[in-house]
């Protein structure tokens, strides 16, 4: 009742080895690590035979075959490559994710190498079988905003790519006879959430609360240059509008709004967001220069609907700048405080612009971005929303221009976006 | 086409309250504000307020805040606008209109003792 | 609120004659944002509901006849009847929406 010799499995073993087997002795096949048990093609820990009582064995010694991790789960806004020649999947290959760069970056500098471990999963040292996060990345234009010298430049045609987090936010509200329509403009946060001023989404017409327009009624705009050719801008619906809770109809204050998008937007060197500032109650130092655009629609004689049918020109009908200085913020109280009317400069807001005017943001339509450079980051920072401004021509002598400090509001941001301010930290500070 | 028909006329007395139907077709009622204005016998018009029957957003003019109240009813798409302690002064032809452009034919309110 | 004070309270003009009502009101009615003029023009006939004319103080209701026009910015605005019809004679108010709605207290227009 002598069964016969048995060869391991070539990358396995048989327990217990032993020189002879007799009826009723039982053998465990198992295989090395990263290798599993096949036997009729389905794949187990160990296997167990027989010796039966006529010599032979209960069943033929099935195969160790390698662990297959398979193909690795698709990385949103990120690549895959393989360091293992043919692209193999098996024990101990390895991949390596990365971001798409340069507009998206890995989340807490993730090294994104992951190996197939002998569960048949791929694995990273630090994340175990999650995968990386992609986040964009913000404040870096494809194209090199100009450096700041201290001198004026208004109506400065952009270059494409120059403010790629430019948003033009065109409201139609239906619920009017005739429909009201009008405009502003927005800055890029994320692929999925626009920051504006809360007054581009109200209701413009005697809502005496602060009613939002509906979501039906907003389209936005991105990695638009001309308003003649939309062509290459990506529009996109609202999923969701939210004006800050505070905001003031009659002295604009906690002027700040956000739009999230039906659907995230690709980022591109055309569209890519810009940077929220740190947490800062000071906002932007008196001197420092900035940056705003806008499509300088401020002739009163254009009509919104002139602007969004294509074919039509108007006088700025490719994205402008302008670089302004931001002005002491007694000095700016003092300049509305001498004009009749009622005008309230708060601790939410600061201004900008020149003593002896010249240049002011009618370039850049209300809730659009004033962005620093931040030479920390090396990255543009959003520290103000184009909010309101005197009653005298735009531009006039010593009438600034009012903006919302967005350092204010960093928190109340992040809370609304659903995103832990640890999360996004690191696309701010370096 | 667009119409707005409003229920017929009514009298009451001082004191009282009155509310008058607007029932709306050929557009989608949701979607649309619907203005109340009403014109004293000889007199010119005053408006009262307004309601978008989608969200039930209702604005007042300061003189009717407290004593008219809008409602709408989607199913049947019909404004309704009740006008509460009512005085002889109350008198007129009260209209509902779409936003600016359609108005109802008018209900007179009589308020008499 | 928004006082609305038309000019002149009647007005008597033959027939095929232009007819010209003044409406002023309190403040502005100059929405920056979207750039329009928040003021509408009504015809009211005897024992009518009024009848739009003239919507953003100088788009021309549809159906409307080309000799009804209106002009004006920010606080002043006027109604043309170019040639006056027997069927004009009506009264004439213009409203403000860019606020709570305010109308003005009409205009009478009759055939001289």
């Known amino acids: 009742n002598e069964c016969p010799e048995l060869q391991p499995p070539v990358h396995g073993k048989i327990e217990p080895s032993q020189a002879k087997y007799f009826f009723k002795d039982q053998v465990l096949v198992s295989c090395d690590t990263g290798y599993k048990v096949l036997k009729d093609n389905v794949e187990m820990d160990t296997f167990q035979i027989e010796c039966l009582k006529d010599g032979t064995w209960s069943n033929k010694i099935p195969t160790c075959k390698i662990v297959d991790c398979r193909a690795p789960g698709e990385l949103e806004h990120g690549l895959i490559t393989f360091s293992t020649r043919n692209n193999l999947t098996t024990y101990k290959s390895e991949i390596k994710y990365s971001c798409q760069e340069p507009y998206y970056k890995m989340l807490n500098n993730n090294t994104g190498i992951y190996t197939c471990s002998a569960q048949g999963v791929w694995m990273n040292k630090v994340l175990g079988r999650s995968l990386p996060t992609c986040l964009p990345e913000c404040g870096q234009p494809s194209r090199s905003l100009p450096s700041l010298v201290k001198r004026i430049i208004g109506g400065r045609n952009a270059e494409p790519g120059l403010f790629p987090w430019q948003a033009l936010i065109v409201v139609e509200d239906t619920s009017r006879v005739p429909n009201d329509k009008w405009f502003g403009s927005g800055a890029l946060l994320s692929a999925s959430w626009i920051l504006t001023a809360a007054h581009v989404l109200r209701s413009q017409r005697r809502d005496t609360t602060v009613i939002p327009v509906s979501k039906e009624h907003v389209t936005v705009y991105l990695g638009l240059h001309d308003v003649r050719d939309k062509s290459g801008a990506v529009n996109s619906s609202a999923a969701r509008v939210v004006l800050h809770p505070d905001f003031n109809i009659q002295n604009y204050n906690h002027d700040i709004a956000l739009v999230q998008l039906q659907e995230p937007v690709p980022l591109g060197p055309h569209v890519m967001p810009v940077c929220l500032p740190r947490l800062e109650p000071e906002g932007p130092a008196p001197h420092m220069l900035g940056l705003v655009a806008g499509w300088g629609i401020s002739n009163p004689n254009v009509t919104v609907d002139e602007i969004i049918s294509s074919g039509t020109r108007t006088l700025s009908d490719v994205l402008q700048y302008v670089k302004l200085p931001v002005v002491p913020h007694a000095e700016c109280k003092t300049s509305y405080e001498s004009r009749s009317g009622n005008y309230s400069v708060t601790e939410n807001m600061f201004c900008a612009g020149y003593y002896e005017g010249g240049k002011d943001t009618c370039l850049g339509d209300s809730g659009g971005a004033f962005v620093i450079f931040d030479d920390l980051s090396q990255r543009w920072v959003v520290q103000g929303l184009v909010s309101w401004g005197g009653p005298e021509e735009c531009g006039s002598k010593q009438v600034y221009g009012v903006y919302t400090k967005v350092s204010n509001y960093v928190d109340w941001v992040w809370e609304q976006m659903g995103l832990p301010q640890s999360v996004v930290e690191p696309q701010v500070e370096r | 086409q667009v119409q707005l028909v409003q229920s017929g006329a009514e009298v009451k007395k001082p004191g009282a309250s009155v509310k008058v139907s607007c029932k709306a077709s050929?557009?989608?009622?949701?979607?649309?504000?619907i203005e109340w204005v009403r014109q004293a016998p000889g007199q010119g018009l005053e408006w009262i307020g307004e309601?978008?029957?989608?969200?039930?957003?209702?604005n007042y003019a300061q003189k009717f805040q407290g004593r008219a109240t809008f409602t709408a009813d989607s199913s049947t798409s019909t404004a309704y606008m009740e006008l509460s302690s009512l005085r002889s002064e109350d008198t007129a032809v009260y209209y509902c209109?779409?936003?600016?452009?359609?108005w109802g034919q008018g209900t007179l309110v009589t308020v008499s003792s | 609120d928004i006082v609305m004070t038309q000019s002149p309270d009647s007005l008597a003009v033959s027939l095929g004659e232009r007819a010209t009502i003044n409406c002023k009101s309190s403040q502005s009615l100059l929405n920056s944002r979207t750039r329009k003029n928040y003021l509408a023009w009504y015809q009211q006939k005897p024992g009518q509901p009024p009848k739009l004319l003239i919507y953003?103080?100088?788009t021309r209701e549809s159906g409307v006849p080309d000799r009804f026009s209106g002009s004006g910015s920010g606080t002043d605005f006027t109604l043309t009847i170019s040639s006056l019809q027997a069927e004009d004679v009506a009264v004439y108010y213009c409203?403000?929406?860019?606020?709570?709605?305010?109308f003005g207290q009409g205009t009478k227009v009759e055939i001289k």
């Open positions: 209109l779409r936003s600016e452009d359609v």
């Open positions: 409203k403000q929406s860019y606020n709570i709605p305010t």
């Open positions: 050929g557009y989608t009622f949701t979607g649309k504000w």
């Open positions: 309601i978008l029957p989608g969200t039930g957003s209702t």
């Open positions: 953003w103080a100088s």
